[in-house]
Interface confidence: low
Amino acid sequence: SGVFQLQLQEFINERGVLASGRPCEPGCRTFFRVCLKHFQAVVSPGPCTFGTVSTPVLGTNSFAVRDDSSGGGRNPLQLPFNFTWPGTFSLIIEAWHAPGDDLRPEALPPDALISKIAIQGSLAVGQNWLLDEQTSTLTRLRYSYRVICSDNYYGDNCSRLCKKRNDHFGHYVCQPDGNLSCLPGWTGEYCQQPICLSGCHEQNGYCSKPAECLCRPGWQGRLCNECIPHNGCRHGTCSTPWQCTCDEGWGGLFCDQDLNYCTHHSPCKNGATCSNSGQRSYTCTCRPGYTGVDCELELSECDSNPCRNGGSCKDQEDGYHCLCPPGYYGLHCEHSTLSCADSPCFNGGSCRERNQGANYACECPPNFTGSNCEKKVDRCTSNPCANGGQCLNRGPSRMCRCRPGFTGTYCELHVSDCARNPCAHGGTCHDLENGLMCTCPAGFSGRRCEVRTSIDACASSPCFNRATCYTDLSTDTFVCNCPYGFVGSRCEFPVGLPPSFPW
């Protein structure tokens, strides 16, 4: 099922005459009859097998036809059909003159015909209008036409019936070819099968509407991929429904018997090691300094006499402390103190005893420092070099490596950047704090006046009489190309008329 649409656009009958050549009085009040029929190699009279339609009077002699309803008629004209579009057709368009208001064929004189056109060909279903223009000796008709499918009909021949729906029998819209296009969330031949929540377990879950995941017995979770253990399972899991597989450290039918008291209750104190020894039983192995079933009691750490070499032990909140006799040091008074006899001074330092030999002091040679003369003196630590100079240690002395533009022992003297005459082509050099600047003469540019800038000698429009000006870049001068009839370096002089020739 579909509609053949004909859009009349313009009719030209400049002389206002009928097909017979006789003029209309007072003008040709024109209406149209349209006949649509099956394809004929030669279009001949006979039944309009695909339909017929007439218009009201649309205008007089020559006129354009509006795209909307006009005088009760419609434009485009509609020729509906309720069969498969065959892809070919014949079309007859007759223009008639209406002397009065009665447009019925039997009410018109036979010579009221203004023009008649007949075309035939192939025409595919589609939205695009096909434009045509038919001209006779007296008239011209411009029109366009197309075939479109009726609502709910699709395909190349408008033969596929498809009506969109969203109910128990299907959830779809129709594609241009009439095939079903499922609404989001539906699938299947007639789009009746919902698409479950993404990831919903294929066997353990199902859905009755899109994006849903309903669990079958024994399964739970958003995607129905978690089994349900049997009722009362305390510390266990399942791999299939109604199981109770115990977690580590638990036992019994309901996994409620504690086999790992150490892990679940941490009974041992003060860093002791816990060992399981049966259901709800354990043993604590205490760290030194602690005792009791749970190692909760603290022993005095001085009981083990930790201080050596006659040191005396004092208990403290976080342990103990040894008070060492003279000549000993260390956590347990295990080390004896140094004296000059132990040669403690490095790099040629000399040792001096103090406090009757109980301790000593080192006197260091030049370039070394530290309590044992172990450190070399760095003469660059004071940053003596100015203006970003780099300090270098050179044996007992130091030197400064200066940045460009500076000199002197400590890079304190500024060298003039202009001393090298860096500006080309007579440019003037200016010393600046961070370098130099060149002021360039006319015709030159760049940081060092190294770029030759061409002067546009044509800028002042030196050529007369519409001559074309060219700049000579090598000499910065101009050349004028004179039009016919003028000479001179600026084309300023008119040439005299050429002499007349004797022939």
């Epitope: 070919t88 035939q120 695009n128 434009l131 045509d132």
Partner: nanobody, 125 residues
Amino acid sequence: EVQLVESGGGLVQAGGSLRLSCVASGDTSEIYDMGWFRQAPGKEREFVSSIHWGGRGTNYTDSVKGRFTISKDNAKNMVYLQMNSLKPEDTAVYYCAATRLIVYTPTGFRQYFDWGQGTQVTVSS
């Protein structure tokens, strides 16, 4: 023949806008209508929108109605596609197309179709 060159594609975030342009050259006096098609990876080329060169109206596919607007400039032989409220599913190569009228033959009318090279539109989420 009509030559078509598209421009204006690019990368844009979802909800953003792009304006595609297509310039026609060659036998432009024969153009009947112009429009846009698109082709996403692994999918067939699909119609997006068209505009009648003589000013007789526009067409849009349902998924872009209210978001895309097609327009033309006959003097410049240009057609434009203003794309607003872009979605990730609008990601595709967009092709300009022109139908040229239309030759009458003994078997009916024949319509010619010309394609551009395409411009990539990518909408990120």
